[in-house]
């Protein structure tokens, strides 16, 4: 009996560790700033790091600039996108900018898409002012399905903050679907 | 064998217990007002409560102004920072201020800050504006490891607003590493 | 033995997979558009959807408003409010805006009510300009006993989004109180 | 209660100097802009400019700009004022004062006078 | 800079008889949603005392026949009862912009 007991613990353990990591994708994903989109107009921004600094994936895929799950589940998905301008770096088009971020789900059987959270603010950036910074965090827990892509769009990508601890976005499952 | 199937019920029961528990440290940590540095310089904040109102922690330490990793996993960490003045309490040094957080990481093996998440925003707070008000929120998902350190350093220290709902940061861990 | 085995093998399915279920409530819930408040005072909004769109409840209660809390334990609290004022709309009463939200907790046994977290800015919406808009998130982990509620109060409720991706709130639970 | 303290009188001739102070207690200094006003004799208010002790920002009037320096020392809760290549039309009282909580100058030194002379 | 321009430049009331002085800005004192003017009463030898702060507000102490109005760039200070000890010099203020600006003054005599 203490053999099969030893046998039933160990079988148990495997499956309650692999049940675990099944169980719980992750992404954080950070902005890769040598393919930025210039201009003002809302894009979809296609180029994220997912593996060196904090950026980081497991369980998910990152392809075509889209975060890709795969497995069903109830994530909870992030967001966090900072914007800034220096005088050094050149006027800007326009003072009155609109600063936004969008988290998207498409679905490659219905390809359509559909904004799941949305933030930002408009802002009124002087040209007498030296220095302007401006960061948008964005989080809300959603259903998602095997093969339902996640990505970010954003106005004025050209104003972006490439830094890793400025532009990023992430999901983390927390549930299975019952 | 009925004795033996308790048993190992048992022992499966504590064992999914503790490990659960083990596994899921935590911690919210709000303002300590009373402690607050003065000035408009970038410091860091040391005094934090954990045991009052909704502070809390638990498997994590606080210590020396920051909360430190007992137990190697990731982490979803965030933190809400808010400023505000009133002309009752005097007058602002500036209109123009850049109001920021930054929430870094430091390892005691290797003796060096990083920062994780960044947020905030420059800000005109004219003074002729009986209030002023401004919040930052960023959150995002890390690997940390035991003994590694967690800090939240803001600019304009002495513009932050010292309730518990208002400025806090905190921590709870999601899943092992593999 | 073998037989007696699978019974344990079973039976811990099934205990695994019904406590990982009652041990994970959860809510998203967004703005009923149908029923905002007006006026620019700070009021409880009390219309909020949970199951049409992207919002969704699982072993919680939405009622009379309020987020009703069926489990103890320890959960991930967020909200995101967005505002926005475009000139064809009507003219603001004011042109300063103190736009601000706050995430309260109720106990029943104690009618009292506790903000848990604020969040917002002051803001100057100059009538020259077009179109406004600024969100604020808010998140933070706290621990909820059985029959607790929460709710969202918001300043300037007439201003509020009424999207989906834009104004909602939810819960979900990370682990169990000890 | 807020009370602001200054120096006493100064004869000067025309070309000289003068460095008065005003000492501030009974409210952090650091916090408010502390504001300089001079009266000629018979004449109107003038305000001059404003030092914001903390990190030491000044704001001054285009007109003394060229020969007006405001400045403090925090250890001592003292705002000081120099006013250079004096000219017999500087002959003043000039006041430091600081706003009330919410506005308007509601705290006054009382006064130093100043008198230039040949 | 704003010009602050104050009349009468002085003016002789009897004592119980109400009196009114008028500060005109060359351009708008008022900013969010307020109005950046206040009034300063000096009798001879003494600094300035607060009368009036931001356009109509009693300053704490200020005895309750004093009162303020206007808004924008004109702006009113009125005495409604005047006594003796009211015999002074009264100056307008403005602090809505760098540089601060007062009033050339109004020199109030008692019948």
């Known amino acids: 009996i203490r053999a099969e007991k030893a046998m039933v613990d160990g079988s148990w353990l495997d499956l309650a560790k692999r049940s675990k990591l099944e169980a719980q994708p992750f992404a954080h994903l950070t902005i890769n700033a040598t393919d930025i989109p210039s201009g003002s107009h809302k894009v979809s921004l296609s180029s994220w790091y997912h593996d060196r600094g904090w950026a980081k994936i497991s369980n998910m895929t990152f392809s075509n600039g889209k975060l890709i799950v795969n497995q069903d589940g109830f994530y909870y998905l992030y967001a966090n996108i900072c914007f800034r301008h220096h005088e050094t770096s050149g006027d800007l088009a326009t003072e009155y900018l609109q600063l936004m971020v969008y988290v998207t789900k498409t679905s490659i059987k219905i390809p359509s898409s559909h904004t799941l959270m949305k933030g930002g603010s408009t802002k009124y950036w002087s040209g007498n002012s030296e220095f302007h910074f401006y960061s948008i965090n964005v989080g809300g827990f959603f259903k998602l399905r095997s093969g339902e892509e996640i990505s970010i769009e954003v106005s004025n990508p050209s104003l972006l903050d490439p830094d890793q601890d400025a532009t990023y976005f992430g999901a983390f499952k927390v549930r299975d679907i019952d | 064998i009925r004795a033996e199937k308790a048993m190992v019920d048992g022992s499966w029961l504590d064992l999914a217990k503790r490990s659960k528990l083990e596994a899921q440290p935590f911690a919210h940590l709000t303002i300590n007002a009373t402690d607050i540095p003065s000035g408009s310089h970038k410091v860091s904040l040391s005094s934090w409560y954990h045991d009052r109102g909704w502070a809390k922690i638990s498997n994590m330490t606080f210590s020396n102004g920051k909360l430190i990793v007992n137990q190697d996993g990731f982490y979803y960490l965030y933190a809400n920072i808010c400023f505000r003045h009133h002309e009752t309490s005097g007058d602002l040094a500036t209109e123009y201020l850049q109001l920021m957080v930054y929430v870094t990481k430091t390892s005691i093996k290797i003796p060096s800050s990083h920062t994780l998440m960044k947020g905030g925003s420059t800000k005109y707070w004219s003074g002729n504006s009986e209030f002023h008000f401004y919040s930052i929120n960023v959150g995002g998902f890390f690997k940390l490891r035991s003994g590694e350190e967690i800090s939240i350093e803001v600019s304009n220290p002495s513009l932050l607003d010292p309730d518990q709902d208002a400025t806090y940061f905190g921590a709870f861990k999601v899943r092992d590493i593999d | 033995i073998r037989a007696e085995k699978a019974m344990v093998d079973g039976s811990w399915l099934d205990l695994a997979k019904r406590s990982k279920l009652e041990a994970q409530p959860f809510a998203h819930l967004t703005i009923n558009a149908t029923d905002i408040p007006s006026g620019s005072h700070k009021v409880s909004l009390s219309s909020w959807y949970h199951d049409r769109g992207w919002a969704k409840i699982s072993n919680m209660t939405f009622s009379n408003g309020k987020l009703i809390v069926n489990q103890d334990g320890f959960y991930y609290l967020y909200a995101n409010i967005c505002f926005r004022h475009h000139e064809t709309s009507g003219d603001l009463a004011t042109e300063y805006l103190q736009l601000m939200v706050y995430v309260t907790k109720t106990s029943i046994k104690i009618p009292s009510s506790h903000t848990l977290m604020k969040g917002g800015s002051t803001k100057y919406w100059s009538g020259n300009s077009e179109f406004h808009f600024y969100s604020i998130n808010v998140g933070g982990f706290f621990k909820l006993r059985s029959g607790e509620e929460i709710s969202i109060e918001v300043s300037n409720p007439s201003l509020l989004d009424p999207d989906q991706d834009a104004t909602y709130f939810g819960a979900f639970k990370v682990r169990d109180i000890d | 209660q807020v009370q602001l303290v200054q120096s006493g009188a100064e004869l000067k001739k025309p070309g000289a100097s003068v460095k008065l102070s005003c000492k501030a207690s009974g409210y952090t200094f650091t916090t408010y802009w502390l504001q300089w006003v001079r009266q000629a004799p018979g004449q109107g208010l003038e305000w001059m400019g404003a030092i914001y002790p903390g990190p030491g920002n000044t704001k001054y009037t285009q007109k003394f700009k060229d020969r007006f320096t405001i400045t403090a020392d925090k250890s001592k809760s003292t705002a000081y004022m120099q006013l250079n290549s004096l000219k017999s039309e500087d002959s003043a009282v000039y006041y430091c004062?600081?706003?009330?909580?919410?506005?308007?100058?509601?705290?006054w030194g009382q006064g130093t006078l100043v008198t230039v002379s040949a | 800079n704003i010009v602050l321009t104050q009349s009468p430049a002085s003016l002789s009331v009897s004592l119980g008889q109400r009196a009114t002085i008028s500060c005109r800005a060359s351009e708008s004192v008022d900013s969010y949603g307020r109005s950046f003017m206040h009034w300063y009463q000096q009798r001879p030898g003494q600094a300035p005392r607060l009368l009036i702060y931001l356009a109509s507000n009693l300053e704490s102490g200020v005895p309750a026949r004093f009162s303020g109005s206007g808004s924008r760039t004109d702006f009113t200070l009125t005495i409604s009862s005047v006594e003796a000890e009211d015999e002074a010099t009264y100056y307008c203020?403005?602090?809505?912009?760098?540089?601060?600006?007062f009033g050339g003054g109004t020199k109030l005599e008692i019948k």
């Open positions: 004062a600081r706003r009330g909580s919410r506005r308007g100058i509601a705290y």
């Open positions: 203020q403005q602090d809505n912009e760098d540089p601060y600006t």
